[in-house]
C-alpha cells in the first residue's frame, strides 16, 4: 500500500502461452510486494472482430498508471493488445474497454467456472 509495509494482493492468473512459457495456464496468483511498493492486478486481451481472446492476467508491479483504479478498464482506442490494471483483490476478473475518445463501453464477464476437483 506504499505506507511502509509490504503489500499482499491476490489476482486472477491466466497465460494463453502457458505451454511455451512453462507456466500454469490459469488459477490464482498471490502477489507479495516489497516494502513501499504497490501491487496491482492486470488483464490483457485481443479483440478479433468482436471475438475476445484472453492473453494474460495476473499480478502487475508498482505502476502509477494503476493507482486507485478499482476496476480494470482499458482506455486505448484500438490497440493490438488491450491492457488494463487495477487495485483490489481479484479486480482483474472482469475487464472493460472504454476508449477515452468515446464509443461504446464493452465489459467482458469471465465464463462460469466449474468447481475444481481435488484428488
Amino acid at each position: 500500500s506504499g505506507r511502509g509495509e509490504a503489500e499482499t494482493r491476490e489476482c486472477i492468473y491466466y497465460n494463453a502461452n502457458w505451454e511455451l512459457e512453462r507456466t500454469n495456464q490459469s488459477g490464482l496468483e498471490r502477489c507479495e510486494g516489497e516494502q513501499d511498493k504497490r501491487l496491482h492486478c492486470y488483464a490483457s486481451w485481443r479483440n478479433s472482430s468482436g471475438t475476445i481472446e484472453l492473453v494474460k492476467k495476473g499480478c502487475w508491479l508498482d505502476d502509477f498508471n494503476c493507482y486507485d483504479r478499482q476496476e480494470c478498464v482499458a482506455t486505448e482506442e484500438n490497440p493490438q493488445v488491450y491492457f488494463c490494471c487495477c487495485e483490489g483483490n481479484f479486480c482483474n476478473e472482469r475487464f472493460t474497454h472504454l476508449p477515452e475518445a468515446g464509443g461504446p463501453e464493452v465489459t467482458y464477464e469471465p465464463p462460469p467456472t466449474a468447481p475444481t476437483l481435488l484428488t
Epitope: 499480478c59 498508471n65 488491450y82
Partner: antibody
C-alpha cells in the same frame, strides 16, 4: 544489499563445456526468477533463457536449445548456466539477472558478468 | 520472435541536452517494455519497466512512454554520467528480445 556474484573468467577450447555460477544474496532466492543474458564483444544483448528457482521451470532461447542447461541450488542460493559444444561465436560476457515473478518481469539486479573465451 | 528496433543507433549530445530514443516492436507488446543503461565494461542497469515506471533509485530526468508497438525513452537534461548505451527489451512473449542499442556520445 541485494546482489548477484558470478564466477570468474573462463577460457575454453571449441567443443568443450562451460558452467557459470551466480550466487544470490540479500533477498529470498525462490521469490524471483533468474535470466541469463550474453553479450559478444562489441555487440548487443542476447537473452539466453530463464529459470524459476521456486519450481525449476526453465525456458530457453530456441537457438541454444539442446546446448544450454540452467539449474539452481536453493540450499546455496546459486544459479548455474552450462553451455556445451562451445564454438568461437559463444565468446561473450555472460550475465545473470534477477527477474520479478510478476508482470512485466523486469530484470532488476544483474551480476557483474563472466567472460567466456572460446579459442583453439 | 518479436523484433525490437531502436533508433537512432547513436546520438551525439551535450550536457544539458534533451535526448529521445525510440524503440519499435514488430508486434503489439502492450506495456511489457523495459529500458536499460549500460556503460563500457559494466552490467546493464534497469531504468524503466512497464514502459513508463521508473525503477527505484533512478533519477527523475529519465522517463519512458508508449504502449503497443512504439516506445520512447527521454533524458530531460543529459548529465555527464548518462553517456552510455541504452537498450529496450520486451518481456511480452518468449524469447525475450532486446533492441540493438543506442549509444549516447559526447558532442
Amino acid at each position: 544489499q541485494v546482489q548477484l556474484v558470478q564466477s570468474g573468467a573462463e577460457v575454453k577450447k571449441p567443443g568443450a563445456s562451460v558452467k557459470v555460477s551466480c550466487k544470490a544474496s540479500g533477498y529470498t532466492f525462490t521469490s524471483y526468477g533468474i535470466s541469463w543474458v550474453r553479450q559478444a564483444p562489441g555487440q548487443g544483448l542476447e537473452w539466453m533463457g530463464w529459470i524459476s528457482p521456486y519450481n525449476g521451470n526453465t525456458n530457453y532461447a530456441q537457438k541454444l536449445q539442446g546446448r544450454v542447461t540452467m539449474t539452481t541450488d536453493t540450499s546455496t542460493s546459486t544459479a548455474y548456466m552450462e553451455l556445451r559444444s562451445l564454438r568461437s561465436d559463444d565468446t561473450a560476457v555472460y550475465y545473470c539477472a534477477r527477474v520479478s515473478m510478476y508482470a512485466p518481469e523486469p530484470m532488476d539486479v544483474w551480476g557483474q558478468g563472466t567472460t567466456v573465451t572460446v579459442s583453439s | 520472435d518479436i523484433q525490437m528496433t531502436q533508433s537512432p543507433s547513436s546520438v551525439s549530445a551535450s550536457v544539458g541536452d534533451r535526448v529521445t530514443i525510440t524503440c519499435r516492436a514488430s508486434q503489439g507488446i502492450s506495456r511489457w517494455l523495459a529500458w536499460y543503461q549500460q556503460k563500457p565494461g559494466k552490467a546493464p542497469k534497469l531504468l524503466i519497466y512497464a514502459a513508463s515506471s521508473l525503477q527505484s533509485g533512478v533519477p527523475s530526468r529519465f522517463s519512458g512512454s508508449g504502449s503497443g508497438t512504439d516506445f520512447t525513452l527521454t533524458i530531460s537534461s543529459l548529465q555527464p554520467e548518462d553517456f552510455a548505451t541504452y537498450y529496450c527489451q520486451q518481456a511480452f512473449s518468449h524469447p525475450w528480445t532486446f533492441g540493438g542499442g543506442t549509444k549516447v556520445e559526447i558532442k
